[in-house]
Interface confidence: low
């Protein structure tokens, strides 16, 4: 796998994706949710755009929800919301994002969570993954499967 070595990483963290993403690329993020966490965010970036924003929110109007979206030309698009919420404050997690030809597939702690259809079609230009939020980040890496 390519990416950051295991060990504490500074958040927000920036994982370069040289050459962009391609189908069958698997991105794995390991960490621990901080106590009383508010949010986590993964941002797959294409230049100034966010191709895929994966945003678990621990307390949105007293509800836990995962919001996915795309940001183009500084405008957020239509939100896709997921009420299944596998993250727990203070607990370790594993997020895996599998790139498929027409969507991202996200699994958390080895269980499928959601898929998000590509709104940015030029996958080869999605060249960075930003990781931010209330987490202690252990590692971030990618490999082909």
């Amino acid at each position: 796998p390519y990416g950051a070595p295991a060990g504490p990483l500074i958040v927000p963290y920036n994982l370069p994706l040289p050459g962009g993403v391609v189908p069958r690329m698997l991105i794995t993020i390991l960490g621990t949710v901080k106590p009383n966490a508010n949010r986590i965010a993964l941002d797959f970036q294409r230049g100034n755009d966010v191709a895929f924003h994966f945003n678990p929110r621990f307390n949105e109007n007293n509800r836990r929800v995962i919001v996915c979206n795309t940001k183009l030309d500084n405008n957020w698009g239509r939100e896709e919301r997921q009420s299944v919420f596998p993250f727990e404050s203070g607990k370790p997690f594993k997020i895996q994002v599998l790139v498929e030809p027409d969507h991202f597939k996200v699994a958390v702690n080895d269980a499928h969570l959601l898929q998000y259809n590509h709104r940015v079609k030029k996958l080869n230009e999605i060249s960075k993954l930003g990781i931010s939020g209330d987490i202690d980040l252990t590692s971030a890496s990618y490999t082909m499967i």
């Epitope: 500074i10 927000p12 920036n14 106590p35 966490a37 949010r39 941002d43 960075k128 931010s132 209330d134």
Partner: antibody, heavy 120, light 110 residues
Framework: EVQLVESGGSLVKPGGSLRLSCAAS????????MNWVRQAPGKGLEWISS????????YYADFVKGRFTISRDNAKNSLYLQMNSLRAEDTAVYYC?????????????WGRGTLVTVSS | QSVLTQPASVSGSPGQSITISCAGT?????????VAWYQQHPGKAPKLMIY???YRPSGVSNRFSGSKSGNTASLTISGLQAEDEADYYC??????????FGGGTKLEIK
């Protein structure tokens, strides 16, 4: 409109204390990391401290450790900097700054600054 | 003394391109840490021009570009204009979770 407004800067004697405040508006304050950055007259920018949205991750520059304390009140959309044991070399404009996950941690919103003068 | 090293000044004529360097170490610029660039006009607050090494915030001219190679980051301004005359600062996270700034570079338009 996204805005940060600092207050609390004044003339203080060496060894004295001061509390700076920053009022945030136009964005979800609790989502973002906040920072204090200062700039002495005619000098460059100097990062002082940062605090995450939930006040659990707090970092300081070595030159203020033990003297300055950063804090925030998300209910009031406010950021604070308590400065103790002030020295002449702490004289500077103090900026309240947001660093957003949507800008890769870049400090994308700055206040106008508040002037702190330490002199006898 | 700044941890990141920038030239004290650079100059260029209108229409030309200039590059400002920002030299660090493997503990800051050379690590997987985001480098940002800020522009500051006299008497004004700094403005974010580049983040995550090479990305421009909305509203920043595409004449500004950033890059990073090894322990050195660079800001390039093409097609220089009079309003580009300002101080420019680089910044990076460090391996101990702090942030550091460069000493600043004064850009003069001849």
């Amino acid at each position: 409109e996204v805005q940060l407004v600092e207050s609390g800067g004044s003339l203080v004697k060496p060894g004295g204390s001061l509390r700076l405040s920053c009022a945030a508006s136009g964005f979800t304050f609790s989502n973002d990391d906040m920072n204090w950055v200062r700039q002495a007259p005619g000098k460059g920018l100097e990062w002082i401290s940062s605090i995450d949205g939930s006040s659990r991750s707090i970092y300081y520059a070595d030159f203020v450790k033990g003297r300055f304390t950063i804090s925030r009140d998300n209910a009031k959309n406010s950021l604070y900097l308590q400065m103790n044991s002030l020295r002449a070399e702490d004289t500077a404009v103090y900026y309240c700054v947001r660093s957003s996950g949507y800008s890769g941690g870049g400090m994308d919103v700055w206040g106008r600054g508040t002037l702190v003068t330490v002199s006898s | 003394q700044s941890v990141l090293t920038q030239p004290a000044s650079v100059s260029g004529s209108p229409g030309q391109s200039i590059t400002i360097s920002c030299a660090g170490t493997s503990s800051d610029v050379g690590g997987s840490y985001n480098v940002a660039w800020y522009q500051q006009h006299p008497g004004k607050a700094p403005k974010l021009m580049i983040y995550s090494d090479s990305y421009r915030p909305s509203g920043v001219s595409n004449r500004f570009s950033g890059s990073k190679s090894g322990n050195t980051a660079s800001l390039t301004i093409s097609g220089l204009q009079a309003e580009d005359e300002a101080d420019y600062y680089c910044s990076s996270y460090t391996s101990n979770s702090a942030r550091v700034f460069g000493g600043g570079t004064k850009l003069e338009i001849k």
